[in-house]
């Protein structure tokens, strides 16, 4: 897994009319690190673990940057040609990553209305865009409108490339990025289902990184997919993870019945409570 | 239709310059892709060397770096490559190509460095 | 830098026969950032097949592209003689641009 630091600004508007704001949120290795609101843009550490680590200055920083892009963003927003009725959405979104072998990686992508339409690998400045007409029309109005913007500001997109990577090496060294693997807390709890059923919930809180398996069985194999219920695995906002998985059984056969959970290699199985 | 054309000295000194131009005809190297220097040894496989992007962003081969430099007119629609202290190893057969999936190549340069 | 190795270094076969060419990464390649060539000699490489399984302006329906990661493949459904040659991999993702060592495709 290479290491990651992900901007994601989103700028609307209104019939044509660019509003003012952002929404900006970053993310760190994959785990929510920033966040800006809209009105405002104050960035937020998301979760004890990065403010701890890092200072004041970082934030100032970050604000100021991502209260830059954000502006950049609306500007671009603004010369997108067929903007319709109603509301639109402008997303950008920037990646940067280390690999393991120190090589890196870095693009940014922009969504209309969700849609992907332009993507450019900012090592290297080559664009690509999908093959549909709309898409194509759209990155081309973009592309000209940044192209221009480039030349006039004589910022390049490699100094983009650079300042993220800059960025995500400053974090690093910071220590708030520990390559680290947190096992979650597992908890089976009960509950009345209807008459003669019960239903039984496994939760797994507090781990990282976010790839885990959860899952019933019955006699030790697996119970078919639609016979369970998934919750989504959500940061809890301490930098790890939570999620849940239930299902129904018939009260007295509880014996029968675990839940197996595998993380990082791990893997353990937790019984229905008596 | 969009062509490259390979120009300069085919024989360089020992610890000189080489110096090469490529003529880029039916399309503006202002106003997309990397404009690159390939090189193939005799025999050998293909070493990508650096560009100059449509922006005029240059990059560089690490293996190369400290000797390699590629600029480029925009009024003639050339790009070139300087390539300084040159030895025997530099022999090779020197390409321009257009892109990033070099779609459009020149026909090739032999350069041999000998005294 | 990203290393790609090709395997096989020679490859002898027959034509009307199936070729099957690999490529693999010392580090995960985007796809769209990753192409292959045909060289023959005395001439200049040609783009074959861009960003993984694009076929370039006219070469034949015979050849394709697929792959992600660090492991991609060319095919050759069923080798005409003017498809022996040497074949070269290439990435783009990432700053220096590298090719595979090449796979010499043979007459048996």
């Known amino acids: 897994e290479p290491h990651s630091l992900r901007y994601n600004l989103t700028v609307l508007s209104w019939d044509g009319s660019v509003q003012s704001g952002f929404l900006a949120e970053v993310h760190l290795d994959g785990q929510p690190f920033l966040r800006c609101d809209r009105q405002k843009c104050r960035a937020k550490p998301q979760g004890q673990w990065a403010e701890d680590v890092l200072g004041n200055k970082t934030w100032d920083r970050e604000t100021r940057d991502l209260t830059g892009n954000g502006k950049d963003l609306r500007m671009t927003l603004a010369h997108i040609k067929d903007q319709k009725e109603g509301l639109h959405s402008l997303q950008e979104i920037r990646v940067c990553e280390i690999h393991e072998d120190n090589s890196t990686r870095s693009s940014q992508h922009f969504y209309y209305d969700g849609e992907l339409f332009l993507s450019q690998n900012l090592e290297t400045e080559e664009w690509t865009m999908p093959q549909s007409s709309r898409a194509q029309t759209l990155a081309m109005n973009v592309r000209n409108f940044l192209k221009e913007d480039a030349m006039k500001t004589k910022t390049h997109y490699h100094a983009m490339h650079a300042d993220c990577l800059q960025e995500l090496r400053r974090y690093l060294k910071s220590g708030v990025v520990l390559r680290r693997t947190v096992p979650p807390m597992v908890n089976v709890t009960r509950s009345e289902a209807s008459e003669g059923n019960i239903t039984v919930t496994c939760r797994a809180s507090g781990f990282y990184p976010w790839n885990i398996t959860l899952s019933w069985r019955q006699d030790g194999v697996s119970l078919s997919h639609d016979t369970q219920q998934w919750g989504d695995v959500l940061p809890d906002g301490n930098g790890t993870y939570q999620t849940w998985v239930a299902t129904r059984i018939c009260q007295g056969e509880e014996q029968r019945f675990t839940c197996y959970m595998e993380h990082s290699g791990n893997h353990s199985t937790h019984p229905v409570p008596s | 239709q969009v062509q490259l054309q390979e120009s300069g000295p085919g024989l360089v000194k020992p610890s000189e310059t080489l110096s090469l131009t490529c003529t880029v005809s039916?399309?503006?190297?202002?106003?997309?892709?990397?404009w690159n220097w390939i090189r193939q040894p005799p025999g050998k496989g293909l070493e990508w060397m650096g560009f100059v992007s449509y922006s005029g962003t240059t990059k560089y081969n690490p293996s190369l770096k400290s000797r390699v430099t590629i600029s480029r007119d925009t009024s003639e629609n050339q790009f070139s490559l300087k390539l300084s202290s040159v030895t025997a190893a530099d022999t090779a057969v020197y390409y321009c190509?257009?892109?990033?999936?070099?779609?459009?190549w020149g026909q090739g340069t032999t350069v041999t460095v000998s005294s | 830098e990203i290393v790609l190795t090709q395997s096989p270094a020679t490859l002898s076969l027959s034509p009307g026969e199936r070729a099957t060419l690999s490529c693999s990464a010392t580090?995960?390649?985007?796809?769209?950032?990753f192409h292959w060539y045909q060289q023959k000699p005395g001439q200049a490489p040609r783009l074959l097949i861009y960003r993984t399984s694009n076929l370039a302006s006219g070469i034949p329906a015979r050849f394709s592209g697929s792959g992600s990661g660090t492991s991609y493949t060319l095919t050759i459904s069923s080798l005409e003689p003017e498809d022996f040659a040497v074949y070269y991999c290439q990435q783009g993702t990432t700053i220096p641009f590298t090719f595979g060592q090449g796979t010499k495709l043979e007459i048996k």
């Open positions: 580090s995960s390649i985007s796809s769209i950032y």
């Open positions: 039916g399309y503006s190297i202002t106003s997309d892709y990397a």
């Open positions: 190509a257009r892109g990033y999936g070099f779609d459009y």
